[in-house]
């Protein structure tokens, strides 16, 4: 389970309410740190192990998830075609 414990407002850009969120996540046995719906989350460790990143549902609802080549990360494709790429070190 994760909860937002701090929301840092970006005052220089008023239309962007929250620039950064700090989450506190307490993972259960068999879970480790991941991303779900573009937020920090605890996910099944087997997803991380097998690098099936899209199984943790990392993209926002309505976006499409695809694995990068060599499973080095994933892309989230918005309905308009914009692509966000996340690589895992």
């Amino acid at each position: 389970t994760c909860e937002v414990i701090a929301a840092h407002r970006d005052s220089s850009q008023p239309r962007r309410t929250i620039a950064r969120q700090t989450a506190r996540c307490a993972c259960r046995k068999g879970q480790i740190a991941g991303t779900t719906r573009a937020r920090p989350a605890c996910v099944d460790a087997r997803i991380i192990k097998t690098k099936q990143w899209c199984d943790m549902l990392p993209c926002l609802e309505g976006e499409g998830c695809d694995l990068l080549i060599n499973r080095s990360g994933w892309t989230c494709t918005q309905p308009g075609g914009r692509i966000k790429t996340t690589t895992v070190s």
């Epitope: 989450a23 506190r24 307490a26 993972c27 046995k29 068999g30 480790i32 605890c42 460790a45």
Partner: antibody
């Protein structure tokens, strides 16, 4: 190099208490779940206790539940096992171990017995009158 | 409880397979040359090998059974091999009783 150094073993009396300490070095201690595992003459390897990377969660094996307390000091890179009401069957070698997964900041993570990648040399405990 | 064979034997150069089943999450394999002596992880997280462990050691998971394979076994590999994982309920760690590997 990752090193885990246990201390505090020795001859103990039945009904007494012992405190074992594991001093860690060579890695970011606060990011890893830690374990105590023992090897007793009659039972092979036995899970004793574990603690999450941030110390917020603890778990104990059935043989020591109610008698054991595991704690950690991330500032000192130490993990401690307190065992009370000692019995003869607590005799054995006690090992400190590290779970390999490096938990990122903002997360509290358990270790996994199958992910133990480093062990201490062990400290011998003998419970006898 | 985990199930692993109590003993296996092989000639130098042969391939040895030791199985472990009955757990959940991930499996590790731990080598011990004599009782009470140091434990050495040869495989962790199903198939990961520490950098100082020879490549002849490998691990593979199939369902809830993990297999430790030693390809081209050497005299120095003679030891007891314990498997470790979480119990089926995922509430505590559990270890196998150990498999004694004898190199003939």
């Amino acid at each position: 190099a990752v090193t885990l150094d246990e201390s505090g073993g020795g001859l103990q009396t039945p009904g007494g208490a012992l405190s074992l300490v594991c001093k860690a070095s060579g890695f970011t201690f606060s990011s890893h779940g830690m374990f105590w595992v023992r090897q007793t003459p009659g039972k092979g390897l036995e899970y004793v206790a574990e603690i999450t990377n941030d110390g917020s969660g603890t778990n104990y094996g059935s043989a020591v539940k109610g008698r054991a307390t595991i704690s950690r000091d991330n500032g000192q890179s130490t993990v401690r096992l307190q065992l009370n009401n000692l019995r003869a069957e607590d005799t054995g070698t006690y090992f400190c171990a590290r779970s390999t997964y490096e938990c990122p900041g903002g997360f509290s993570c358990w270790g996994d017995t199958g992910q133990i990648d480093a062990w201490g040399h062990g400290t011998e405990v003998i419970v006898s009158s | 409880a985990l199930t692993q064979p109590s003993s296996v034997s092989a000639n130098p150069g042969e391939t040895v397979k030791i199985t472990c089943s009955g757990g959940s999450y991930s499996y590790g394999w731990f080598q011990q040359k004599s009782p009470g002596s140091a434990l050495v992880t040869v495989i962790y997280w199903d198939d990961e090998r520490p950098s100082d462990i020879p490549s002849r050691f490998s691990g593979a998971l199939s369902g809830s059974t993990n297999t430790l394979t030693i390809t081209g076994v050497q005299a120095d590999d003679e030891a007891v091999y314990f498997c470790g994982t979480e119990d089926i309920s995922g509430t505590a760690g559990v270890f196998g009783a150990g498999t004694t590997l004898t190199v003939l």
